[in-house]
């Protein structure tokens, strides 16, 4: 992981850009805490394992979250 930071927030910049759910390895949603006041959404991409910080307020990202949770609920028995 680049930039070992003392502050617990991870995201210095965020992206509104939509992410194709099929290109996602992992999606982490970190709720606000005493260490970081932001909701942080970190997408790990299949290609090269690159990570992106996503904007939780972006319409495209909200749609992505819906798609991912729908996919998860399909898979769970």
């Amino acid at each position: 992981i680049p930039l070992s930071r003392t502050v617990r927030c991870t995201c210095i910049s965020i992206s509104n850009q939509p992410v194709n759910p099929r290109s996602l390895e992992k999606l982490e949603i970190i709720p606000p805490s005493q260490f970081c006041p932001h909701v942080e959404i970190i997408a790990t991409m299949k290609k090269k394992g690159e990570k992106r910080c996503l904007n939780p307020e972006s319409k495209a990202i909200k749609n992505l979250l819906k798609a991912v949770s729908k996919e998860r609920s399909k898979r769970s028995p």
Partner: antibody
Framework: QVQLVESGGGVVQPGRSLRLSCAAS????????MHWVRQAPGKGLEWVAV????????YYADSVKGRFTISRDNSKNTLYLQINSLRAEDTAVYYC????????????????WGQGTLVTVSS | DIQMTQSPSSLSASVGDRVTITCRAS??????LAWYQQKPEKAPKSLIY???SLQSGVPSRFSGSGSGTDFTLTISSLQPEDFATYYC?????????FGGGTKVEIK
Amino acid sequence: QVQLVESGGGVVQPGRSLRLSCAASGFTFSNSGMHWVRQAPGKGLEWVAVIDYDGIIQYYADSVKGRFTISRDNSKNTLYLQINSLRAEDTAVYYCATERGTHYYGSGSFDYWGQGTLVTVSS
Amino acid sequence: DIQMTQSPSSLSASVGDRVTITCRASQGISSWLAWYQQKPEKAPKSLIYAASSLQSGVPSRFSGSGSGTDFTLTISSLQPEDFATYYCQQYNSYPPTFGGGTKVEIK
């Protein structure tokens, strides 16, 4: 296209204060981490400070900690650097720079740079 | 802090030459390395990020390679507009640090 325009530099006496500004346009400023980088005359580049997209996180180089304050006003698309207790060694061109545009987690490389503003500390 | 050592500090070359600049980190930085070009009295310009990814709009004659501690910037065929100073920069950990620069001059 992305534009960063610094202002506020000038000749100041040691011990005085100065506030630099960086007006941003052509990208989503409120999503972008922003940095200040400086360059002393005839020398290399030195990173000074960073602020996250909404102004909550700030980091500073040890050489400026406690004297410099980075801040931003997302409603005005403007980045600031407040410099207190100026020293001769603070003489430099100060550049503002954006984080890499793709916003990969942990990015700390600089995509776009302003033209710089010269701060000269001299009695 | 991670120290970045660039070599050579200056070099003379002719138009059409292949030019190689190296950058060494004092500890491993994976691929978290960027290269910048700076012309006199101008702001630096981003050339390469993540060690080998070309910034949008940068000519393909520029390329970067390496990972860990040893990195290279190559200009395959030097053009008149490439005479400038080049800096490497690590962004594996704060503070981001730059190499001392390599000045590419006309032979």
